[in-house]
């Protein structure tokens, strides 16, 4: 008999947490676990529960989550990872859109991200997607062409700056940007 | 919103005793790490005790052993610091501090923690 199956990790209400604000880190594994181990990667922190509540989220605090749980002497495979971002840390970039936030289907638009920090990694997040568009840029500046738009990209973006040397240390996010396709 | 608050401080001859508290609010202190640190002036913060490994395991720097005793009542969500036998060099800014993550470490590290309260200062002098 070979490990035991890997739980699910989720952060809710979502990992992008900005600062003070609370966030549960919730294990889930099969009904009648004897143990949880809810863990903290590249360090040696942890937790022996299914539910990490975070009252207030700290820089901290941010970072690489996996769990596992154990059933009499076996341990299951590990959960994928969770990456628990904080935002806030640093000011908030602007996201413009050009040639402007209108535009026809079948067209094309650049959304582009700026912030006044030398900051070499950007997200791009669309409200109700799971998860945001990366792109590492060397520049003060990073551009995400849409290519051919088409009426599922209209709707409201938002972008975060960060550093490469602290991957789980965001902006706040920028202003919302309306994208509205015609 | 999350806090810690520290009391008890104070000045006290070498020799007194002085028992620091660290009430928290916001949260329970429960499955908890917790920790006291110091920092005096011009030098480095320093892990003075904590209850960091879920075992309830108690570390306790060398320069205070026999003499600190970290303890924590869950139904007052307040740690304690009960310091004997105070010396000059025990003079310094104490601080608590908590986490809901346990850590394997087998000394207190202050990067480990991720709520502080905002120090009280301890002064031992004749």
């Known amino acids: 008999s070979g490990p035991l199956p890997k739980p699910s990790l989720q952060a809710l209400p979502s990992s992008l947490v900005p600062l003070e604000k609370p966030v549960t880190l919730r294990c889930q594994g099969p009904p009648g676990v004897d143990l949880y181990r809810l863990e903290k990667l590249s360090s040696s922190r942890y937790q022996d529960q299914a539910v990490l509540f975070i009252p207030a989220m700290k820089r901290s605090l941010a970072g690489r989550y996996r769990c596992s749980y154990q059933n009499g002497s076996l341990w299951s495979l590990p959960s994928d990872q969770l990456e628990l971002v904080a935002t806030g840390v640093f000011a908030k970039p602007s996201l413009s859109a050009q040639p402007g936030p209108a535009v026809s289907s079948g067209g094309d638009v650049t959304l582009q991200c700026q912030t006044r920090y030398g900051f070499d990694q950007f997200a791009l997040y669309k409200e109700g997607d799971p998860a945001p568009y990366k792109n590492p840029e060397r520049w003060y500046r990073a551009s995400f062409p849409i290519i051919t738009v088409t009426a599922a990209h209209s709707g409201t973006y938002r972008c975060y700056s960060f550093s490469s040397r602290d991957p789980y240390l965001w902006s706040a996010p920028s202003d919302p940007l309306e994208l509205v396709v015609t | 919103q999350v806090q810690l608050q520290e009391s008890g401080g104070g000045l006290v001859q070498p020799g007194g005793s002085l028992r620091l508290s660290c009430a928290a609010s916001?949260?329970?202190?429960?499955?908890?790490?917790i920790g006291w640190f110091r920092q005096a002036p011009g030098k480095e913060r320093e892990g003075v005790s904590c209850i960091s490994s879920s075992d309830g395991r108690t570390y306790y720097a060398d320069s205070v052993k026999g003499r600190f005793t970290i303890s924590r009542d869950n139904a007052k969500n307040t740690m304690y610091l009960q310091m004997n036998s105070l010396k000059p060099e025990d003079t310094a800014v104490y601080y608590c501090?908590?986490?809901?993550?346990?850590?394997?470490?087998?000394?207190?590290?202050?990067?480990?923690?991720?709520?502080w309260g905002q120090g009280t200062q301890v002064t031992v002098s004749s």
């Open positions: 916001g949260f329970t202190l429960d499955n908890y790490a």
């Open positions: 501090a908590t986490s809901p993550l346990y850590s394997d470490s087998d000394r207190c590290i202050w990067e480990e923690y991720d709520y």
